[in-house]
Amino acid sequence: NQDLPVIKCVLINHKNNDSSVGKSSSYPMVSESPEDLGCALRPQSAGTVYEAATVEVDVSASITLQVLVDTPGNISCLWVFKHSSLNCQPHFDVQNRGVVSMVILKMTETQAGEYLLFIQSEATNYTIVFTVSIRNTLLFTLRRPYFRKMENQDALVCISESVPEPIVEWVLCDSQGESCKEESPAVVKKEEKVLHELFGTDIRCCARNELGRECTRLFTIDLNQTPQTTLPQLFLKVGEPLWIRCKAVHVNHGFGLTWELENKALEEGSYFEMSTYSTNRTMIRILFAFVSSVARNDTGYYTCSSSKHPSQSALVTIVEKGFINATNSSEDYEIDQYEEFCFSVRFKAYPQIRCTWTFSRKAFPCEQKALDDGYSVSKFCNHKHQPGEYIFHAENGDAQFTKMFTLNIRRKPQVLAEASASQASCSSDGYPLPSWTWKKCSDKSPNCTEDIPEGVWNRKANRKVFGQWVSSSTLNMSEAMKGFLVKCCAYNSLGTSCETILLNSPGPFPFIQDSIS
């Protein structure tokens, strides 16, 4: 370690000065002070590889990745990005440290990735790895739609303040529950901003643009439905509009609806009523309670009462900031190879979350289902029995939430072998992590039962490959062993697997797959 160079990796942020950005003069930008990137030797890497902390950059931002090297004598270097070599010109600072820089002007998606810097000095060669990613803040926005009452009309306007301008549609359904799924024949869509028919069972407004689709449901209490076991709860942020619809059907018009907040009647101008006769000549009444911009004191129990139905309530909670409530402790699971299993996260959130499940740096779509108790659940079953780390990530603009899961698949080892002129290596990824034995095959021991007690080096689970543990064992070869067959065996509680290796001079090594018990 004392012989290795002292490396410092820094990030320099530049405030773009558009008139000069992109010109080849040295740093046509105002620079912020350098930020340390914690360069350190990558564990268990072949050769001397330093790694810098992952860098996250905004689109169009300009940065410099810089390496300061404390090493005697001259250095030469080469940058490599996406298999292309880039020019590298080291210079020396006042402290006589070698300085190598990579300027990235106006960051784009194509400039994200791994930047490799190869440095050669008189004493040693080494590599420095920078991972640069784009921060996920887009210039485009898609905001959840909200409702407003149309001036002088009994109609609702749906508004979504989004860029680019979204297409707004009403999604209406007159059935209950599952039959109101998006693609159901019971669902009617109207691509317009104003809705006059406000008597439907389920009313949603959706806005969509390049970023996707966001929907808001009109919160409804139906006095003809059996109340939920848990009180329905509606969350809103300070300043957002509140809309609650109370709906009731009766055999004739001889009934009325009223709204109360904490046993006090709502003020005039905070509600409006509509009524109509249905096809079977029953009367439908709806009464809207609305507040154009809620404050903390709008929190409370909103109760809809009828002269002919039992009253029902909803709890409206006004929060300063959105939230995601869930337990973020990591969870470890151990399952059999063909066992059915799903990861599951139960959460309460407002506004509604966007979420992803990630495995092996690949994102999977995330579905969420609302439960009756005000919580939601997201399940992930598409793990295909691949062991490793699975990440559930949710965000809603105000809050972020990450939960880690580890999946271990119980299975017997599968051995992979490789050899060089000086050693033979075997590795296996079975679980539980296997132990190793090495046997020598000779005239005395044709069945390869003679133990090799020396020269074996085991590295249990030396590397995390997206959370998957790998165990390896290496046999250092002596001259006396050349030309012999040796056998490495990995075993755990589920079985044993072996590989036979012919130890000879460098060149192709024949491997004989042995019996697996």
Epitope: E35, G38, Q44, E51, V55, T131, T402, A461, K464
Partner: antibody, heavy 124, light 107 residues
């Protein structure tokens, strides 16, 4: 130059809430996968890990203290704040913050830089 | 939570001695382990990360080994400035946990 500095009250009364601030310089949460750990050490005893927060707001807490701890960060001030409710004399300790670095290939470096620590005494 | 058991809890040694401290995890933690040195009244200092990687600026007489559940910190030739308390820390699984420490004293 990377530095971390803890600040907060020297003396806290039982049942009160402790608020500790770790002010960092020489690195930031804004542009790199960085995090901060809080660790404490009662006089003459071992180190105890309390909580951490990463640049992406990923957080984790000590199981035994989870209900009492909240960790947050203020990127603009380069600060990480730890609050601990319902303080008790057994919480008397030196509280340290230390840096965590996250790397693209999936490993972490814990505590390459530490603050000098701040001694908090809980007494009525 | 994963328990980290350090042994011995204290040891006496002379300058030039080879010193070995072990840390055992209650379950496999791969190589997600660091070793720290702490002197009285000072903050801990990182010596070894990822079980066996030497932190920049740390003398090469310090070395770490092991993976899975058993880990070792070795000081090949004890120097006067090495008398201190040493801790291991696992970051394999939350909550991260320290060993109870090993105090290295002058014989």
């Amino acid at each position: 130059q990377v530095t971390l500095k803890e600040s907060g009250p020297v003396l806290v009364k039982p049942t009160e809430t402790l608020t500790l601030t770790c002010t960092v310089s020489g690195f930031s949460f804004n542009n790199a996968r960085m995090g901060v750990n809080w660790i404490r050490q009662p006089p003459g005893k071992a180190l105890e890990w309390l909580a951490h927060i990463f640049s992406n707001d990923e957080k984790s807490y000590s199981t035994s203290l989870k209900s009492r701890l909240t960790i947050s960060k203020d990127i603009s001030k380069s600060q990480v704040v730890l609050t601990m409710t319902n303080m008790d004399p057994v919480d008397t300790a030196t509280y340290y913050c230390a840096r965590i670095v996250g790397y693209g290939s999936g490993w972490r470096l814990l505590g390459d830089y530490w603050g000098q620590g701040t001694l908090v005494t809980v007494s009525s | 939570a994963i328990q980290m058991t350090q042994s011995p809890s204290s040891l006496s040694a002379s300058v030039g001695d080879r010193v070995t401290i072990t840390c055992r995890a209650s379950q496999g933690i791969t190589n997600d382990l660091g070793w720290y040195q702490q002197k009285p009244g000072k903050a801990p200092k990182l010596l070894i990360y990822a079980a066996s990687s030497l932190q920049s600026g740390v003398p090469s007489r310090f070395s770490g080994s092991g993976s899975g559940t058993d880990f070792t910190l070795t000081i090949s030739s004890l120097q006067p400035e090495d008398f201190a308390t040493y801790y291991c820390l696992q970051d394999y699984n939350y909550p991260w946990t320290f060993g109870q420490g090993t105090k290295v004293e002058i014989k």
